[in-house]
């Protein structure tokens, strides 16, 4: 919405724009207005940007008015929160940034018959971005001076220069995000995607075979398994086989059969032939032993002279028997040839989860960290390893230890600094966590441990000359008594500086006002109105630019009056034969100096900037990413050091590129996993991760690698009629009209006949940026004077 607040009004004499009094006649003595004051109210008209403001035409952005808010002079700066002096114009379209504002002060007649009368009017064309800050404007010419402030604010959840970017935080199944100060969605931890409703799966989860609906999860597709869903499930019953794809059973070396359970190398796997017998594979799971002399049996296990070959291992003694031989084993060994180490770990003697290691004729316990001793039956003292970092003491417990943390620390080893920042800092202060404490860093204008105190900038009584000090956040304002001005009321106001008196009139400063002593031909508060002598005095045409009039103001008794046929922007030059020419001021041309020269003809705005013609001047509205009087400077988008983790920044047009190092990815080298995050593509673009780069798919109206450049498409073909300049505004446009035209696309001819330029009942004929007066009988001249 567009908001306007009237701050003050000064209409010292209670006059109207036409020089009359608001409330009746003038006092014959001091020529001041008598009777009651003006009943002042304000009207506002907001419309599209016009380089030359025209009063007529529709208020295409809205209009409104205040009730009567005061008399001749009033100051409402102190009465904040009073809505009577505020006009709010809501808009349901994207804010175009550039605008024209007409503000008029009116006197209410309180009378159904008598119409209201205009006191003063102000116009302002400019550009304003949405902000909470007010912009103060002043109307300092004419019979009345007034001050007002304006701002444009976006509705809740709307962002951007056009208030057309919507972002409302949410945390439900539609999305899990907050909104940053630019209206971009910032996903909560564990969520991603344009709507932050796609869960970020467990790191390492196979993108092909795993997925998740909840953060940190990894659910496997049919046929896949493992923590990261990257291992295929082999065929059920597969023994000595693996898989590359689900349900395969690819046999390991020397295994065969559908389930890889047939041993093709029984000899190699089992080495069945004893006593130096030679083994031959004869088929799956089949073999044959060729025995050396003195041995027989399927596995050459029968020794014909048994003890000759020292069959008893590990210092066992051999005794020949009728069946062959018998071994008597040394301690710790068993089996027919004393080759089996007796398992001293059965039963397991290790306590408290200790792991038993079998030795020859004995065992050894490998204890968990909390236990010690031969069978892990003794409690270990964990405090000897000094595990406590920030602690008063370490206490050994059974199978554990306890760290008595110093204040401000927590965790098993007192190595986690407790976050003492729990929202104690007020007034948008930032909180710095300390050990066992915190510190509030106050924004300007606040003090106190919690920034709870508004610093009173009025405490030093800075206002001079009886000025009233008003304390505000991080500043103060002096409300000055009449006759003083300046930020400290240190200046004695000279109402004659700058001189308000026109047409060479002398200005006299008073305590709270000024007085203009007018030359004979002029009248009004500022001597701005030409007296109509022709009503009483006969006029004589001298030449096609001048008339002479009897006057007792000059020694010759004659006063010469120049024609205004050349309008406000030229001087009349008389030519022979009753003709004339116009000598135009700088910036104007045409027969009557009515055409503003197009200073944009030379296309001075570079890099796609739009040129807006002024009077003997021009202004460049730069494309995104450019600045300077001619849009010649590429804004350095690297100035904020956006590249993280050692990335190198390269400035582009309205964009930057990060050259990432050491495996970092993404627009700002912020991620190990993905090229995309919610800030990669601007203006609603969709980000696609393409492995070693990202790609933005831009919505209509935007282009560039990150959808950062507004397409000219909204201005192609030019929608602005009658020579209007088109300014791209996202997916929309604004027309800056040439003089004489108005409306959203400059299609309406400005009413050059407003307000009534033809005198003495002359009829006005409106043209394209010109008018002609058809005079009543007995009158002549360009304005029938």
């Amino acid at each position: 919405q567009f908001e306007l607040e009237i701050l003050s009004m000064q209409n010292v004499n209670g006059e109207l724009q036409n020089g009359n009094c608001c409330g009746g006649a003038r006092n014959p003595g001091d020529r001041k207005c008598t009777r009651d004051e003006c009943d002042t109210y304000f009207k506002v008209c907001l419309k599209e940007y016009q380089s030359r403001v025209t009063a007529g035409g529709p208020c295409s952005f809205g209009s409104g008015s205040t009730p009567v808010i005061g008399g001749n002079t009033f100051n409402l700066k102190a009465s904040r929160g009073n809505d009577r002096n505020r006009i709010v114009l809501p808009f349901s379209f994207a804010w175009p940034r550039s605008y024209t504002l007409l503000v008029e002060a009116w006197d209410s007649s309180n009378d159904t018959v008598q119409p209201d009368s205009i006191i003063e009017k102000a116009s302002h064309s400019g550009m304003i971005n949405p902000s909470r800050q007010w912009q103060t404007l002043k109307q300092n010419t004419g019979v009345a001076h007034f001050e007002y402030q304006i701002r444009v604010t976006c509705d809740d959840y709307y962002y951007g220069f056009g208030c057309n970017k919507f972002c409302r935080p949410r945390d439900d199944f539609f999305g899990h995000y907050a909104c940053d100060q630019n209206g971009n969605k910032t996903c909560m931890e564990g969520w991603m995607g344009p709507e932050c409703n796609r869960a970020i799966c467990r790191q390492g989860c196979s993108p092909k075979h795993g997925s998740c609906k909840l953060p940190g999860d990894c659910r496997c597709q049919y046929g896949w398994q493992g923590l990261y869903c990257d291992k295929c499930i082999p065929h059920p019953g597969c023994v000595h086989g693996i898989c590359n794809e689900p349900w395969q059973c690819l046999c390991e070396t020397n295994w065969g059969g559908q389930l890889c359970d047939k041993d093709l190398n029984y000899c190699g796997t089992h080495q069945p032939c004893l006593n130096g017998g030679t083994c031959s594979n004869t088929g799956p799971d089949k073999y044959q032993c060729s025995c050396p002399e003195g041995y027989s049996g399927p596995n050459c296990e029968i020794a014909e002279h048994a003890c000759l070959s020292d069959p008893c291992h590990n210092r066992g003694s051999c005794k020949e028997t009728s069946l062959g031989f018998e071994c008597e084993c040394s301690p710790g060994w068993t089996g027919p040839t004393c080759s089996t180490n007796i398992d001293d770990c059965s039963p397991n003697n290790c306590s408290h989860g200790g792991t038993c290691q079998d030795l020859v004729n004995g065992f050894k316990c490998v204890c968990p960290p909390q236990w010690t001793g031969k069978t892990c039956q003794l409690d270990a003292n964990e405090c000897e390893a000094k595990p406590c970092v920030n602690a008063k003491s370490c206490k050994n417990l059974i199978a554990s230890y306890y760290c008595d943390c110093l204040p401000g620390w927590m965790g098993q080893n007192c190595d986690i600094n407790i976050n003492d920042c729990l929202g104690q800092c007020q007034n948008d202060a930032s909180c710095r966590d300390l050990v066992n404490g915190y510190r509030c860093i106050c924004p300007p204008g606040y003090a106190g441990d919690h920034c709870e105190r508004d610093i009173d900038e009025c405490a030093s009584n800075p206002c001079l000359n009886g000025g009233h000090c008003q304390n505000e956040i991080n500043r103060f304002q002096c409300l000055c008594p009449t006759g003083f001005s300046g930020n400290l009321c240190q200046l004695d106001i000279d109402y004659c500086e700058p001189n308000p008196c026109q047409n060479g009139a002398q200005c006299y400063n008073r305590a709270s006002d000024y007085f203009c002593k007018c030359p004979e031909d002029y009248e009004g508060k500022n001597c701005s109105h030409l007296k109509d002598h022709c009503r009483t005095t006969p006029c004589e045409v001298i030449d096609s630019c001048t008339v002479a009039m009897a006057s007792n103001d000059t020694p010759e008794g004659v006063r010469y009056i120049s024609s205004n046929v050349c309008g406000p922007h030229g001087k009349c030059k008389s030519q022979s034969g009753g003709k004339f020419t116009c000598d135009c001021n700088k910036g104007f041309t045409g027969t009557y100096c009515h055409e503003n020269i197009n200073d944009c003809e030379s296309n001075p705005c570079r890099n796609g900037g739009t040129c807006i013609d002024g009077v003997n001047s021009y202004k460049c509205i730069c494309s995104d990413g450019w600045e300077g009087a001619y849009c010649e400077t590429n804004i350095n988008d690297c100035s904020q050091n956006p590249c993280h983790n050692g990335g190198t920044c390269r400035d582009l047009v309205n964009d930057f590129y990060c050259d990432c190092k050491n495996g970092w990815k993404g627009k700002t080298c912020h991620s190990r996993d993905s090229q995309c995050d919610e800030a990669t593509c601007n203006n609603g673009g969709t980000c696609y991760d393409e492995g070693d780069a990202f790609k933005c798919m831009c919505p209509g109206g935007w282009e560039g690698t990150t959808c950062n450049i507004a397409r000219n498409s909204s201005c192609l073909p030019n929608p602005c009629h009658n020579g209007g300049t088109c300014v791209v505004n996202g997916e929309s446009f604004t027309c800056v009209c040439k003089e004489g035209w108005e409306g959203p696309i400059c299609a309406q001819n400005t009413n050059d006949c407003s307000p009534h330029p033809c005198y003495n009942s002359g009829t006005c004929v409106d043209g394209d940026n010109w008018y002609r007066c058809e005079c009543a009988p007995g009158f002549a001249g360009p304005d029938c004077r």
Partner: antibody
């Protein structure tokens, strides 16, 4: 006072269509996500569909996907459920419910409208 | 989809009793869990949202706790008007799912 009023229920043959409406009042309709939840006779609650406040995102239960369409008209403060290819197992009381933008709870419910699918 | 399992399916209690109903999710849902009360022929009514936040206008004898996969609804002192069916519901991800319900009857 928040009010949600469902209408459009009734008896319909299998394969037929029905359109349910939910008229909302007492809150800013365009600021809240809305949902349909149903309850078959003697059974528990079953979520059917949801639509976020601008109508840009919709979700459906697998059992109704492709047959039901949720929509809303923020200018009329009305939520709709277009039900096509109805089956006997769609017989239930259909409730409309509103959700604030945090945690996805259904903080207000309508009184429900009965849909009977039978030949 | 996330399965929600309530226990017990039904329970009998007397006025003044402390009643506890549990709800288990098939996978971690953080605190995105809501509890509803439904009386015969009426629409459900929200009691607790975000696992432990009491909906405005609900008596303080109702409380919720839990996080991750295990959640509890407690009625500290059962009142005559509390005899009803209670449902839990997860709201972190679509499809939204409800528990099968717990019927609290008069002993």
């Amino acid at each position: 006072e928040v009010q949600l009023l469902e209408s459009g229920g009734g008896l319909v043959q299998p394969g037929g269509s029905l359109r349910l409406s939910c008229a909302a009042s007492g809150f800013t309709f365009s600021s809240y996500a809305m949902s349909w939840v149903r309850q078959a006779p003697g059974k528990g609650l079953e979520w059917v569909s949801s639509i976020e406040q601008m109508g840009w995102q919709t979700y459906y239960a697998d059992s109704v996907k492709g047959r039901f369409t949720i929509s809303r008209d923020n200018s009329k403060n009305t939520l709709y459920l277009q039900m096509n290819s109805l089956r006997a197992e769609d017989t239930a009381v259909y409730y409309c419910a509103k959700s604030p933008p945090f945690f996805g709870q259904f903080d207000y419910w309508g009184q429900g409208t009965l849909v009977t699918v039978s030949s | 989809d996330i399965q929600m399992t309530q226990s017990p399916s039904s329970l009998s209690a007397s006025v003044g009793d402390r009643v506890t109903i549990t709800c288990r999710a098939s996978q971690s849902i953080s605190s995105y869990l809501n509890w509803y009360q439904q009386k015969p022929g009426k629409a459900p009514k929200l009691l607790i949202y975000a696992a432990s936040s009491l909906q405005s206008g609900v008596p303080s004898r109702f409380s919720g706790s839990g996080s991750g996969t295990d959640f509890t609804l407690t009625i500290s002192s059962l009142q005559p008007e509390d005899f009803a069916t209670y449902y839990c519901q997860q709201s972190v991800v679509a499809p939204l799912t409800f528990g099968q319900g717990t019927k609290v009857e008069i002993k």
